[in-house]
Interface confidence: low
């Protein structure tokens, strides 16, 4: 589709005569008829196959024709065509005399023709005008012409249709040859594909507008080059989405089980050596002179209550010294000078003679102890609480306050790793020394029976175009990680050529 443009510039008819030689009265009021048609070796009358146009009266006898393109478009004359420009043409230009205002052929005199010219030749599409001058016996016509493409048509033959656009279906202008020239930030055959943020990961990122980087499921970060670990992953990392690879010293499905309490918390004091003994449990080996679960207590030699029979202990630089009560002697007040006659048993204790009265023994009532029943029973002295539990006297009984990870009357039991029902989908839990083991029912596998083997969401290969399939453990659904050039929940649509709708 294009336009053949003809610009009339000057017509000379000095004598003011018709082609027949008859003078026009009062002068030749001149208008033109133009016929454009296919190339003919000899231009002959007949259908104007490429178009025809007529002008109004432009002047009398001799006159210059004004360029009137701005005021109504009469000059240059426009001969539009709706086909591929063939590159050749024939042109007939007739000058007619119109005595009155009616320019219809039947309203003109029978000899109204002033002049008739016919040319033919080759003409390429272009902006440049070709200047020509045709002279007959009595007249001369100067004119120029060219062929240009209509709006939205391009190419050597005006055959390429291109409508510039900037909307959801394309972002481009048209080059002179009709090829698309994408607007900044767009690419692809129809400039529908945005150019993502520089560095945006080809597979894991995409964009819907230029300089954007949107992440596919399982990826994050400004350039979508950081994987998202499994939901709930505490002390772990990933190299592909939904992984949870534990940092050193951590274990469990979510890397939330502390396997290195010693390193992470340094619980042992005063230079003691720490040994990990299971999840969140440890043992401190104290240096000489220290005691306590965490070796936090400095040892005093009197702490072991070496003095018997109510003797009081005094610390000394070189050890300790027992101050014995009346009737007792010896390093630890272990020898008695008393007999039952001296009523040595306190707190209602019964005295029994020994060695023919030379010695005695006290039988103490409940809650009292010592050689003379002088001590209230401290049920914690024997340190009955295991695994670093704290012993508490509660009247006639005692109680162990256990450290985290232990239970039982004497803190002798590890807290069952199975207590929180870690095995999914009805798996059976077994406590082991260093953790637990799940025995999974049919159809499930994994350390915690979390993998549905019989209904693996990826088993049906739902992802197209060689996309990678990931099973989301928490929802038993799949996520497709598309290769470059594809989008969609199953990577089923090419990015460059989505089902088109180019309005």
């Amino acid at each position: 589709s294009g336009v053949f443009q003809l610009q009339l510039q000057e017509f000379i008819n000095e004598r003011g005569v018709l082609a027949s030689g008859r003078p026009c009265e009062p002068g030749c009021r001149t208008f033109f008829r133009v016929c454009l048609k296919h190339f003919q070796a000899v231009v002959s009358p007949g259908p104007c196959t490429f178009g025809t146009v007529s002008t109004p009266v432009l002047g009398t006898n001799s006159f210059a024709v004004r360029d009137d393109s701005s005021g109504g478009g009469r000059n240059p004359l426009q001969l539009p065509f709706n086909f591929t420009w063939p590159g050749t043409f024939s042109l007939i230009i007739e000058a007619w005399h119109a005595p009155g205002d009616d320019l219809r052929p039947e309203a003109l005199p029978p000899d109204a023709l002033i002049s008739k010219i016919a040319i033919q030749g080759s003409l390429a599409v272009g902006q440049n005008w070709l200047l020509d001058e045709q002279t007959s016996t009595l007249t001369r016509l100067r004119y120029s012409y060219r062929v240009i493409c209509s709006d939205n048509y391009y190419g050597d033959n005006c055959s390429r249709l291109c409508k510039k656009r900037n909307d959801h279906f394309g972002h481009y202008v048209c080059q002179p040859d009709g090829n698309l020239s994408c607007l900044p930030g767009w690419t692809g055959e129809y400039c529908q594909q945005p150019i993502c943020l520089s560095g945006c990961h080809e597979q894991n990122g995409y964009c819907s507008k230029p300089a954007e980087c949107l992440c596919r499921p399982g990826w994050q970060g400004r350039l979508c080059n950081e994987c998202i670990p499994h939901n709930g992953c505490r002390h772990g990392t990933c190299s592909t989405p939904w992984q949870c690879t534990c940092d050193e010293g951590w274990g469990g499905l979510f890397c939330d089980q502390d396997l290195n309490y010693c390193t992470h918390h340094s619980p042992c004091k005063n230079g003691a050596t720490c040994s990990n003994s299971g999840q969140r449990s440890y043992t401190c080996t104290c240096r000489p002179g220290y005691t306590g679960v965490d070796c936090e207590l400095e040892l005093s030699e009197c702490d072991s209550n070496p003095c018997r029979n109510g003797g009081s202990c005094k610390d000394q630089e070189d050890g300790y010294h027992c101050l014995c009560p009346p009737g007792y002697y010896g390093l630890h007040c272990e020898h008695s000078t008393l007999s039952c006659a001296d009523s040595p048993c306190f707190n209602g204790g019964s005295c029994r003679e020994r060695n023919q009265g030379a010695n005695y023994a006290c039988e103490c009532p409940p809650n009292f102890t010592g050689s003379n029943c002088e001590k209230k029973v401290d049920r914690c002295t024997s340190n009955p609480c295991a695994n670093g539990g704290q012993c508490l006297n509660r009247g006639p009984s005692r109680m162990c306050r256990c450290r985290p990870g232990f239970t039982g009357t004497y803190c002798e039991l590890h807290v069952s790793d199975c207590a929180r029902n870690p095995c999914a989908h009805g798996g059976t839990c077994h406590d082991l020394e260093n953790g637990l083991m799940c025995t999974c029912p049919a159809g499930f596998s994994g350390r915690r029976c979390e993998v549905r083997t019989s209904i693996d969401a990826c088993a049906s290969s739902p992802c197209f175009n060689r996309a990678t399939c990931y099973t989301d453990l928490s929802t038993d659904t799949f996520v497709c990680n598309c290769p470059y050039g594809f989008v969609g929940s199953r990577c089923e649509f090419p990015v460059g050529l989505p089902p088109s709708f180019p309005w």
């Epitope: 409508k163 909307d167 959801h168 819907s208 969609g488 709708f501």
Partner: antibody, heavy 119, light 106 residues
Framework: EVQLVESGGGLVKSGGSLRLSCAAS????????MSWVRQAPGKGLEWVAI????????YSADSVKGRFTISRDNSKNTLYLQLNSLRAEDTAVYYC????????????WGQGTMVTVSS | SYELTQPPSVSVSPGQTASITCSAD??????VSWYQQKPGQSPVLVIY???KRPSGIPERFSGSNSGNTATLTISGTQTMDEADYLC?????????FGGGTKLTVL
């Protein structure tokens, strides 16, 4: 056979709601833009809404913005139009139409479903 | 807002050519489609991209579009062509329909 079948129309009071469905068959539904067009009795066609092949782009006429919602379920080959806050002027035959690939025209139309809003 | 203007009615004798226009500012820069709708029936696409015919549409239907006017031409009009004809184009993100032209074949 390529076919679009609308359903869900009926009589509803002003201010009420309806959900129209359009079941597609005979072509790859998930690959094409789809639209709803309505025609009030004795009037011309009025475009209502259009949705992209994957549902990511939706456009609607100003007259229904905020009241009507277009959606689709590609797994069911079904197009939907949720009509809320209905008015008397929404009374029309509602057509479901497929936008032909690569041109501006709607090349397949359903038989239409009548929605009547009484005041 | 962008409006497509059509004459309400056009009459033509059988066998003659009917031309139905659709006008809007710089319409020639846009694609125009034409639909035929008979009473009680759904619309049918007869012309798209200004001048292209879908398969099954007779050759007597043709179209053109330049400047501000698109034209649907039916040459050798038949009585079965009596119907409403609607033009349609696109303005930004909106689909725009003309008001429709009733073609009467006398």
């Amino acid at each position: 056979e390529v076919q679009l079948v609308e359903s869900g129309g009926g009589l509803v009071k002003s201010g009420g709601s309806l959900r129209l469905s359009c079941a597609a068959s005979g072509f790859t539904f998930r690959s094409h833009w789809m639209s709803w067009v309505r025609q009030a009795p004795g009037k011309g066609l009025e475009w209502v809404a259009i949705i992209s092949y994957d549902g990511s782009n939706k456009y609607s006429a100003d007259s229904v913005k905020g009241r009507f919602t277009i959606s689709r379920d590609n797994s069911k080959n079904t197009l939907y139009l949720q009509l809320n806050s209905l008015r008397a002027e929404d009374t029309a035959v509602y057509y479901c139409a497929k936008a032909g690939g690569g041109n501006v025209g709607f090349d397949i139309w359903g038989q239409g479903t009548m929605v009547t809003v009484s005041s | 807002s962008y409006e497509l203007t059509q004459p309400p009615s056009v009459s033509v004798s059988p066998g003659q050519t009917a031309s139905i226009t659709c006008s809007a500012d710089k319409l020639g820069t846009k694609y125009v489609s034409w639909y035929q709708q008979k009473p009680g029936q759904s619309p049918v696409l007869v012309i798209y991209q200004d001048a292209k015919r879908p398969s099954g549409i007779p050759e007597r239907f043709s179209g053109s579009n330049s400047g501000n006017t698109a034209t649907l031409t039916i040459s050798g009009t038949q009585t079965m062509d009596e119907a409403d004809y609607l033009c349609q184009s696109w303005d930004r993100s909106d689909v725009v329909f003309g008001g429709g032209t009733k073609l009467t074949v006398l």
